[in-house]
């Protein structure tokens, strides 16, 4: 699986999850998030050669088409597969609130 | 929606579904498919500027991050959203067989 366990331990050029730290205030301008100050959102990148973690029959077909037609511009793209939520603390005035934001952290990637 | 109705009628540079005809024999080397000879598989391509048909909170966050940090290499990618099956005819010896291949045709795209 193209997950953090594999991708963060290997120098993988092809589609894999990459570490990306985002600071809420500096990178997004989100002043309303109190804690954490930032988090590892991660992202997916790298080429999708034929059959690499193909998501659907279409991505397999497209990967094969691309292999046999190297000049073609149509190829699968490396995108998130598994995402996890992030728990944040914010304030409503002086009152602290805890919220779970869904689909915030990329744990693995696929070729789609 | 970034679907064939919209994308095929507009000269859209950003993420959209693009027509792609695939000939089973010539492009994939699939001699076993009798009918059709080929089909419009289509594909997704084009930049994913901030908020363009964002798939998840992560892709929205990544798009925002990319907008505020233009030098960043992390950005969402244009990939299939809705896929449709394709019915094919093939032969087992002289016996015709009809099969529905799932997820063969891209009908719309998203930024993921």
């Amino acid at each position: 699986a193209l997950d953090t366990n594999y991708c963060f331990r290997n120098l993988e050029e092809n589609c894999c999850v990459r570490p990306l730290y985002i600071d809420f205030r500096q990178d997004l301008g989100w002043k309303w998030v109190h804690e954490p100050k930032g988090y590892y959102a991660n992202f997916c990148s790298g080429p999708c050669p034929y059959l690499r973690s193909a998501d659907t029959t279409h991505s397999t077909v497209l990967g094969l088409y691309n292999t046999l037609n190297p000049e073609a511009s149509a190829s699968p793209c490396c995108v998130p597969q598994d995402l996890e939520p992030l728990t944040i603390l914010y304030y409503v005035g002086r009152t602290p609130k805890v919220e779970q934001l869904s689909n915030m952290v990329v744990k693995s990637c696929k070729c789609s | 929606a970034l679907d064939t109705n919209y994308c095929f009628r507009n000269l859209e540079e950003n993420c959209c579904v693009r027509p792609l005809y695939i000939d089973f024999r010539q492009d994939l080397g699939w001699k076993w498919v009798h009918e059709p000879k080929g089909y419009y598989a289509n594909f997704c391509s084009g930049p994913c500027p901030y908020l363009r048909s964002a798939d998840t909170t992560h892709s929205t966050v990544l798009g925002l991050y990319n907008t505020l940090n233009p030098e960043a290499s992390a950005s969402p990618c244009c990939v299939p959203q809705d896929l449709e099956p394709l019915t094919i005819l093939y032969y087992v010896g002289r016996t015709p067989k009809v099969e529905q291949l799932s997820n063969m045709v891209v009908k719309s795209c998203k930024c993921s």
Partner: antibody, heavy 120, light 108 residues
């Protein structure tokens, strides 16, 4: 230039409902919090609630809970306020405003307002 | 909810006079959860002061705010004709946000 434009104000019968829109431009919509404030004719200002568009977290004044729903569409930079079971005392100019960044905060940019009249 | 009591309800002063409006909260707001707005007829409110004493961008220096806890004040050092408006204080320490009832400022 920062702009907030409200629309959807109308003459409504008591018991009816209404959806107001607030379209934002000139700033990073998804990094901000949008509040709704109303003002009855000749009266003061009353805060109704606020929403964080990117994650659709909404906070409401207690007296409007159950009657007001705030939602956001980040693809169109629009915040919506649905107000149901309207009463004559809901007649007011409804403003959307951008906060300085927190859920409860001062509001630095306001729309021009949209008038809602509740009458039979 | 926190009740904000503004005084006076209205005042009429001469041009170049000093204006002081006070705002009292029914419970402590700490030092920074208070804002002041100006509203002219037919217009939306305009933020003048936030955090009790910080001027919003583009607001003339004749406008100032001070105070903490339950007692806050807003001052116009020298009244000008364009300052004719209704002024509101607003607390954002606790939900719901509440406003004072307003002070109508006129020129004699």
């Amino acid at each position: 230039e920062v702009q907030l434009v409200e629309s959807g104000g109308d003459l409504v019968k008591p018991g009816g409902s209404l959806r107001l829109s607030c379209v934002a431009s000139g700033f990073t919509f998804s990094s901000n919090v949008i509040s709704w404030v109303r003002q009855a004719p000749g009266q003061g200002l009353e805060w109704m609630g606020g929403v964080i568009p990117i994650v659709d977290i909404a906070n409401y004044a207690q007296r409007f809970k159950g009657r007001v729903t705030l939602t956001a569409d980040t693809s169109t930079n629009t915040v919506y306020m649905e107000l149901s079971n309207l009463r004559t005392e809901d007649t007011a100019v409804y403003y959307c405003a951008r906060t300085l960044g927190l859920v409860l905060d001062a509001m630095d940019y306001w729309g021009q307002g949209t008038l809602v009249t509740v009458s039979s | 909810e926190i009740v904000m009591t503004q005084s006076p309800a209205s005042l009429s002063l001469s041009q170049e006079e000093k204006v002081t409006i006070t705002c009292r909260a029914s419970q402590s707001l700490g030092s920074s959860y208070l804002a002041w707005y100006q509203q002219k007829p037919g217009q939306a409110p305009k933020l003048l002061i936030y955090g009790a004493s910080s001027r919003a961008p583009g607001v003339p220096s004749r406008f100032s705010g001070s105070g903490s806890g339950t007692d806050f004040s807003f001052t116009i050092s020298s009244l000008e004709p364009e300052d004719v408006a209704v002024y509101y204080c607003q607390q954002y320490a606790d939900s719901p946000i509440t406003f004072g009832q307003g002070t109508k400022l006129e020129i004699k």
